[in-house]
């Protein structure tokens, strides 16, 4: 069997000869050189060589434990004369012993850290870490102690943990923002002869809200024309805050003043300015100057700094309203007028009124926009705004006339306003009723008396308030000895009835009936319409078979049995 223990080797050997490691030995070795020792594995033949006859192992190079602390090799012992192994292959370990040849190295050459300004003493800032490549399990070669070389009295470091903490009260970012701290890490527990390394820690004080906003001036003045529509910006004010970021954000509000309802203030998030804007329409003639009290405040306040005072400031804003020459203003947004359709030319319909709202109260002249009254049916008195007709009207042609009236300042024709005028034409009974259609009907030769052969309907272009009421009758000249009668149904219709039994188409093939239609309005209007009645031969069902030589234009839906 094999005879050896674990091999140990000191790192960084500087001797001139090869460093002796140890001896491989088999109890089968009789010392006669018949055994051959073979080495394989980590560094065999290169870092480690073996005397194949004696089993002595040597290291050929300077070894660094930090590069490789353990080498695993395999040993074989073979009888040269038989070629047979005398031992099974076995693994053995060469362990490299540590010396203090590595200084502590920080994980970063430069650390960056932040801590809030005004922090309490002992507030954690950052932990720095240095590692020592030497063996931590043996001696103090890798026992690191931290100390501060630069950065006092502002900061301190815990010697064992590398934790950096604040060491001074009330460090104010607005006074100083950046600190450079140098930390040393020393091995051997910090004792003499230990190796050391340093790192730089750049510490930035982060902002807290310990400063209120401040207006650089107590009063601001702006001007704006009275014509400024709501939303118009009229000026910017800016309070400054020594803090940064969220802590320097400012909200503006109007807290007092006669302009409270007339103006708004909005905060420009990019510039942190307060923009004064118009809220309601201004009127120079009503009020020329407004004063506002505007407040600038921090939306995010840290309660622990409230003892420093309120985190807001206010300023007075004076706004001067400038006069603007305004166009005339009509008394109404639109006018609705009425006139009878039988009105004579130059009949006055009504009037419009417009005034210059300016203090000057400039006189106004009126005109009709001719694009809206191409036929010049209406006219206006340029001085007093009276509207009158210049042509005859007809309701049945056009019921509503929509025109535009213009009011213009005489001294400044550029200042003008327009208003719509809606003129309704009222109905007058100036149209007679007429047949709704051309009536041509027929009667059967064998018709009986009092048979209905046609129903009559009438139309009237007028539009009486109480609705149409038509009456129907035979014209006086046809009333006596007529072969037909007219029956007024009192519902704006009438019926033509036969007056005798039987008709002879050879005696009389066509009858012309003059019918008078009257309305019931004032003045009464009437007209006479003629109904053509043809005598036809019919079958026993009353269906027309043949009439006179001319073809009968037979109205659709006519009841032939009438």
């Amino acid at each position: 069997s094999w005879m050896w223990n674990q091999f140990f080797l000191l790192e960084e050997y500087t001797g001139s000869d090869y460093q002796y490691v140890g001896k491989l030995h088999s109890d089968q070795d009789r010392g006669d050189g018949s055994l051959k020792y073979i080495l394989s594995g980590d560094g065999a033949g290169d870092l480690f060589i073996i005397n194949e006859n004696t089993g002595d192992i040597q290291a050929t190079k300077r070894l660094d434990r930090e590069e490789k602390p353990v080498y695993i090799l395999r040993a074989q012992a073979i009888n040269r004369r038989t070629g047979r192994p005398v031992e099974p292959e076995s693994e053995f370990i060469i362990k490299i012993h540590d010396i203090n040849d590595n200084e502590p190295i920080f994980t970063k050459e430069v650390y960056t850290a932040t801590v809030p300004e005004m922090s309490d003493v002992g507030t954690f800032v950052v932990q720095v870490t240095a590692t020592d490549a030497d063996d931590p399990t043996y001696g103090n070669s890798a026992k690191v102690v931290y100390s501060i070389l630069q950065g006092q009295p502002y900061f301190s470091v815990e010697s064992e943990t590398g934790i950096i903490k604040t060491a001074l009260l009330n460090m104010d970012r607005e006074n100083r923002e950046q600190y450079q701290v140098v930390i040393q890490a020393k091995d051997m527990g910090g004792q003499m002869g230990g190796l050391s390394g340093t790192t730089t820690v750049n510490i930035t004080l982060t902002d807290v809200n310990d400063n209120p906003p401040r207006f650089p001036q107590s009063t601001y003045q702006f001007k704006t024309p009275e014509s400024s529509p709501p939303g118009t910006p009229i000026g910017r004010i800016k309070a400054s805050d020594a803090d940064v970021g969220e802590n320097a954000e400012i909200e503006y509000s109007i807290t007092d003043g006669e302009g409270l309802d007339m103006f708004d203030v909005i905060t420009d998030q990019e510039t942190q300015e307060g923009i004064i804007t118009v809220k309601k329409l201004l009127d120079f003639e009503k009020k020329k100057v407004y004063t506002l009290k505007v407040e600038a405040s921090n939306p995010y306040v840290e309660p622990r700094f409230l003892y420093l005072g309120p985190f807001k400031d206010s300023a007075t804003v004076r706004i001067v309203v400038e006069d603007v020459d305004e166009p005339p203003v009509f008394s109404k947004l639109a006018y609705i007028l009425q006139i009878r359709e039988d009105a004579q030319i130059n009949t006055t319909i009504g009037s419009v009124t417009a005034q210059d709202p300016d203090a000057a109260r400039n006189p106004v002249k009126y005109s009709v926009d001719r694009h809206t009254d191409m036929d010049r049916i209406f006219n206006i008195d340029s001085g007093n705004g009276s509207i009158f007709t210049s042509k005859l009207l007809d309701r049945e042609t056009l019921l509503w006339h929509n025109i535009t009236v213009i009011a213009t300042e005489i001294n400044n024709p550029k200042q003008s306003s327009r208003v719509p005028l809606y003129i309704k034409v009222l109905d007058v009974n100036d149209n007679a009723p007429e047949f709704a259609e051309f009536y041509e009907t027929f009667v059967c030769e064998k018709a009986k008396a009092d048979q209905l052969i046609q129903t009559l309907h009438a139309v009237d272009k007028d539009d009486p308030y109480s609705g149409h009421q038509f009456s129907f009758s035979l014209a006086p000249e046809a009333a006596s000895g007529s072969n037909f009668t007219i029956q007024d149904n009192k519902d704006n219709t009438a019926g033509i009835l036969t007056r005798k039994n039987g008709y002879n188409r050879h005696e009389m093939s066509t009858y012309l009936l003059p019918v008078v239609i009257s309305d019931n309005d004032y003045p009464v209007q009437s007209s006479t319409g003629t109904v053509t009645v043809r005598v036809c031969a019919c079958d026993h069902h009353g269906n027309m078979q043949s009439c006179h030589a001319e073809a009968l234009i037979h109205p659709t839906g006519l009841s032939t049995g009438a």
Partner: antibody, heavy 119, light 106 residues
Framework: EVQLQQSGPELVKPGASVRISCKAS????????MNWVKQSHGKSLEWIGD????????TYNQKFKGKATLTVDKSSSTAYMELRSLTSEDSAVYSC????????????WGQGTLVTVSA | QIVLTQSPALMSASPGEKVTMTCSAS?????MYWYQQKPRSSPKPWIY???NLASGVPARFSGSGSGTSYSLTISSMEAEDAATYYC?????????FGSGTKLEIK
């Protein structure tokens, strides 16, 4: 060049004995053990035993004790194997082989001697 | 005695194909040795001490294993590799051989 030259084929009767020789050249005969191996026709190999030419110490496979006897003649660098009480089971090719480890491991084989046991 | 069982007894492979044959020992052995034998020739030492190639053996051959399980592998079969391969143990007397794996070329 290392060579192991064996004697020629043998035809022997059952019950008889035979002696096979193996002459070594190209290396120092006493430096390495001589092994003998049997290979029956179409069959595998069997290790018979070995001899240290230095001191004629032998090691046998238990199966071949009483069947094979190994000897050497240092002066002629020759190894011998005698087989006795032959039966048909002993018909095979017998080879000498020398193994060792110098710079690297090696194994030299003789060309083999065919022994046929037949009435 | 330690019995060495080789498998397969017979196998064939195409040129370029990877070939693996195994040798299983009835008891644990420290090392395995392999020999190549072609018809009408003596065996040639092929692999020693489990994984070392004997002088002149092509690098496509490799050996591995431990305890009772060992193998010989050819990474890319060539025609000249057709032969019978025997495993052998020198750990315990009698020093036994396997029954052989005959490798043929397709």
């Amino acid at each position: 060049e290392v060579q192991l030259q064996q004697s020629g084929p043998e035809l022997v009767k059952p019950g008889a004995s035979v002696r096979i020789s193996c002459k070594a050249s190209g290396y120092t005969f006493t430096d390495y053990y001589m092994n003998w191996v049997k290979q029956s026709h179409g069959k595998s190999l069997e290790w018979i035993g070995d001899i240290d030419p230095n001191n004629a110490n032998t090691t046998y496979n238990q199966k071949f004790k009483g069947k094979a006897t190994l000897t050497v003649d240092k002066s002629s660098s020759t190894a011998y194997m005698e087989l006795r009480s032959l039966t048909s089971e002993d018909s095979a090719v017998y080879s000498c082989a020398s193994f060792g480890y110098d710079v690297e491991w090696f194994g030299y084989w003789g060309q083999g001697t065919l022994v046929t046991v037949s009435a | 005695q330690i019995v060495l069982t080789q498998s397969p007894a017979l196998m064939s492979a195409s040129p370029g194909e990877k070939v693996t044959m195994t040798c299983s020992a009835s008891s644990s052995v420290s090392y395995m040795y392999w020999y190549q034998q072609k018809p009408r020739s003596s065996p040639k030492p092929w692999i020693y001490l489990t994984s070392n190639l004997a002088s002149g053996v092509p690098a496509r051959f490799s050996g591995s294993g431990s305890g009772t399980s060992y193998s010989l592998t050819i990474s890319s079969m060539e025609a000249e590799d057709a032969a019978t391969y025997y495993c052998q143990q020198w750990s315990s007397n009698p020093f036994t051989f396997g029954s052989g794996t005959k490798l043929e070329i397709k």
